[in-house]
């Protein structure tokens, strides 16, 4: 079966939308008015992956760019990239599992757990214009909680 | 064996009404975000609507918002897409899903046409 996508943006639990800060670095910010056009929009695609009813396996890519958010280890700490892809060969519905997160719904919101990592969340720091990075607490001073737009193709 | 089959579709003039509904089958509903999903005629698919397994936590597509109202009712194994103020932009094959996961189910969908 091919791998079915959907377009969509996300913010934080504060309303922070997620923008591009250089070609490899995603950062959370306010916007309001036409700013909003700055958001990233992602392609989330639907792949294999461990799956429970609040847990569904994701890949993030970014619309449009070869590129998608991975997890890998680096300094021996699991962190949060954009890796370039092969346009030909992406998405497909294996993924390799450093870019797959799964998909938490709670109340209406919305985590991303890396899957190579467990407990490991995408998250926003609660200080403007951050790097979104990957986060080993919930709960804390750190914001670990999203919200969903779709956006049409 | 699962099966998602829509009815409700049809020919309506602009700024009328229709209600979808698509009944599923082979799986267990209750536990599952499900999706509308419809394709223009020489169009990509869009994704409509989205709602969660309680029902609580709803989506929509920014050119269907204040129009389009999705619901379910799991005692029935039933989603709906009650359809308000219809444009002619809203012409397509309208598809039940189950996107997420391992498995994606699909209906064979039903046709929207508005017209006068």
């Known amino acids: 079966a091919p791998v079915r996508s959907l377009n969509c943006t996300l913010r934080d639990s504060q309303q922070k939308s997620l923008v591009m800060s250089g070609p490899y670095e995603l950062k959370a910010l306010h916007l309001q008015g036409q700013d909003m056009e700055q958001q990233v929009v992602f392609s989330m695609s639907f792949v294999q992956g461990e799956e429970s009813n609040d847990k569904i396996p994701v890949a993030l890519g970014l619309k449009e760019k070869n590129l998608y958010l991975s997890c890998v280890l680096k300094d021996d700490k699991p962190t949060l990239q954009l890796e370039s892809v092969d346009p030909k060969n992406y998405p497909k519905k294996k993924m390799e599992k450093r870019f797959v997160f799964n998909k938490i719904e709670i109340n209406n919101k919305l985590e991303f757990e890396s899957a190579q990592f467990p407990n490991w969340y995408i998250s926003t720091s609660q200080a403007e214009n951050m790097p979104v990075f990957l986060g080993g607490t919930k709960g804390g001073q750190d914001i670990t909680d999203f919200t969903m737009q779709f956006v049409s193709s | 064996e699962v099966q998602l089959l829509e009815s409700g579709g049809g020919l309506v003039q602009p700024g009328g009404s229709l209600r979808l509904s698509c009944a599923a089958s082979?799986?267990?509903?209750?536990?599952?975000?499900m999706y509308w999903a419809r394709q223009a005629p020489g169009k990509g698919l869009e994704w409509v609507s989205r709602i969660d397994p309680m029902g609580s936590s709803t989506y929509y597509a920014d050119s269907v918002k204040g129009r389009f109202t999705i619901s379910r009712d799991n005692s029935k194994n039933t989603l709906y897409l009650q359809m308000n103020s219809l444009r002619a932009e809203d012409t397509a094959v309208y598809y039940c899903?189950?996107?997420?996961?391992?498995?994606?189910?699909w209906g064979q969908g039903t046709l929207v046409t508005v017209s006068s």
């Open positions: 082979g799986f267990t509903f209750r536990d599952y975000v």
């Open positions: 899903a189950k996107p997420e996961g391992n498995f994606d189910y």
